[in-house]
């Protein structure tokens, strides 16, 4: 018996405006009806939770209302949207799969996707 | 699926020591680190201890005193505690994590990649 597996992309660089997306994807042992995800993040040896929901499979995916994350579920595949980045936030992202209910639980961790976020430039001034 | 199973806890004595033991059903130990934590009443749970197939790393606040180590032959984890102290008064829970490579001596015992929770067993360091 071996850790439950999560895939997700090693890489992903956010959109101008702030926006990262990346899928989430388990190989459920079971037949999980309960499922938590959380998004982690590791930096300067640092490690913080971004934000965690959790569903009932086949139901949409519910973050807190000022959670920076979204996502959908679809079978064993969570898409995941993590918006307001900032330069400052380029890090490695974790995705961690909680099978709650029923039991047996299981947790798999991903390997992380490095999110790259670049600062725009600003907009010269204009002269009209 | 991995279970855990903790045992060892009890009352003892300023400077005196406790071993705790944490045992594994269901899978190997090898492919996951595992960790000691424990929670105070009213403070948040802290790393203690975690231990993988080549590394350990300690909370500042034990290293010297508690030692952790692992018999993969038993699937079995201890916690060697000496020179107990009143603060070291807690609910200790043994928890496991998949290995990744991305863990650094810095955040492999992070509680945050943890699951597995075991119901914890109490320590009193008490004269």
């Known amino acids: 018996c071996k850790a439950m597996h999560v895939a997700q992309p090693a890489v992903v660089l956010a959109s101008s405006r702030g926006i990262a997306s990346f899928v989430c994807e388990y190989a459920s042992p079971g037949k999980a009806t309960e499922v938590r995800v959380t998004v982690l993040r590791q930096a300067d040896s640092q490690v913080t939770e971004v934000c965690a929901a959790t569903y009932m499979m086949g139901n949409e995916l519910t973050f807190l209302d000022d959670s920076i994350c979204t996502g959908t579920s679809s079978g064993n595949q969570v898409n995941l949207t993590i918006q307001g980045l900032r330069a400052m936030d380029t890090g490695l992202y974790i995705c961690k799969v909680e099978l709650m209910y029923p039991p047996p639980y299981y947790l798999g961790i991903g390997n992380g996707t490095q999110i790259y976020v670049i600062d725009p430039e600003p907009c010269p001034d204009s002269d009209f | 699926e991995v279970q855990l199973v903790e045992s060892g806890g009890g009352l003892v004595q300023p400077g005196g020591s406790l071993r705790l033991s944490c045992a594994a059903s269901?899978?190997?130990?090898?492919?996951?680190?595992i960790g000691w934590f424990r929670q105070a009443p009213g403070k948040e749970r802290e790393t203690v201890s975690c231990?993988?197939?080549?590394?350990?790393s300690y909370a500042d606040s034990v290293k010297g005193r508690f030692t952790i180590s692992r018999d993969n032959a038993k699937n079995t984890v201890y916690l060697q505690m000496n020179s107990l102290r009143a603060e070291d008064t807690a609910v200790y829970y043994c928890?496991?994590?998949?290995?990744?490579?991305?863990?650094?001596?810095?955040?492999?015992?992070?509680?945050?990649?943890?699951?597995?929770w075991t119901q914890g067993t109490q320590v009193t360091v008490s004269s």
């Open positions: 928890a496991a994590s998949p290995d990744k490579p991305f863990y650094t001596d810095q955040t492999m015992c992070n509680k945050h990649y943890y699951g597995y």
């Open positions: 269901g899978s190997t130990l090898d492919p996951f680190v």
């Open positions: 231990i993988n197939r080549s590394r350990t």
